[in-house]
């Protein structure tokens, strides 16, 4: 017998979280950036 469909035709790959911080001028504050990638 043929198999019934049981996947949605796409995959979710491991997500990569990349953090970075930069000094901002004289106030020494930090900007935190978050990038989420890898979802096809």
């Amino acid at each position: 017998d043929a198999e019934f469909r049981h996947d949605s035709g796409y995959e979710v790959h491991h997500q990569k979280l990349v953090f970075f911080a930069e000094d901002v001028g004289s106030n020494k504050g930090a900007i935190i950036g978050l990038m989420v990638g890898g979802v096809v």
Partner: antibody, heavy 124, light 112 residues
Framework: QVTLKESGPGILKPSQTLSLTCSFS??????????VGWIRQPSGKGLEWLAH???????YYNPSLKSQLTISKDTSRNQVFLKITSVDTADTATYYC????????????????WGQGTTLTVSS | DVLMTQTPLSLPVSLGDQASISCRSS???????????LEWYLQKPGQSPKLLIY???NRFSGVPDRFSGSGSGTDFTLKISRVEAEDLGVYYC?????????FGAGTKLELK
């Protein structure tokens, strides 16, 4: 909330074509992973799966009836249709539509919502 | 086709009893993705079927914990630990791994 409701002619004569409509709300067939199937049940008997259609128009049929069956959808109207050609008295049954979705993210791979059913009598 | 054989076809019980329903498939219903799509549905008179158990042993949302499913390969069981009046009806096992999708003939749970 999710609801499904079947509608049909009620009575047909042998050799006629059955046209069924499943009107639903609370979900959309434009959503990836979503699907709707048809199941029937002769009075006092068991359940028989007929066909299933997915959001991407992929279709599955019961091979024993495939030559008679056509499943289709109108995504914008939230409706799924089933046609059965050349009906016979053996097609007398209650016809149900039910939602079954597939997703890699959530475990929804089952018939979680069913309509109330529409009854067909085939009689000459 | 995958034939789903349920036993017994009729199960008379008293309220508070434990009930056990067996379902055997004519071939393995393990899908190529590793999952076993074995489900149990309850149909009460005049109503549409309602999902109880999916993937052999997972209780659907809102299903009381007196219902439990077990098994593997071709041999599956539904157990009700203490039957209540609202549990009476016809229980169907179902396989969703192979086309055509198929149901068992049903087991009628009724009062003695």
């Amino acid at each position: 909330q999710v609801t499904l409701k079947e509608s049909g002619p009620g009575i047909l004569k042998p050799s006629q074509t059955l046209s069924l409509t499943c009107s639903f709300s609370g979900f959309s067939l434009s959503t990836s992973g979503m699907g709707v199937g048809w199941i029937r049940q002769p009075s006092g008997k068991g359940l028989e799966w007929l066909a299933h259609i997915w959001w991407d128009d992929d279709k599955y049929y019961n091979p024993s009836l495939k030559s008679q069956l056509t499943i289709s959808k109108d995504t914008s109207r939230n409706q799924v249709f089933l046609k059965i050609t050349s009906v016979d008295t053996a097609d007398t049954a209650t016809y149900y539509c039910a939602r079954r979705s597939i997703s890699t993210l959530v475990p929804e791979d089952y018939f979680d919502y069913w309509g109330q059913g529409t009854t067909l009598t085939v009689s000459s | 086709d995958v034939l789903m054989t349920q036993t017994p076809l009729s199960l008379p019980v008293s309220l508070g009893d434990q009930a056990s329903i067996s379902c055997r498939s004519s071939q393995s219903i393990v899908h190529s993705n590793g999952n076993t799509y074995l489900e149990w549905y309850l149909q009460k008179p005049g109503q549409s079927p309602k999902l109880l158990i999916y993937k052999v042993s997972n209780r659907f949302s809102g299903v009381p914990d007196r219902f439990s499913g077990s098994g593997s390969g071709t041999d599956f069981t539904l157990k009700i630990s203490r039957v209540e009046a609202e549990d009476l009806g016809v229980y169907y096992c179902f396989q969703g791994s192979h086309v055509p999708l198929t149901f068992g003939a049903g087991t009628k749970l009724e009062l003695k």
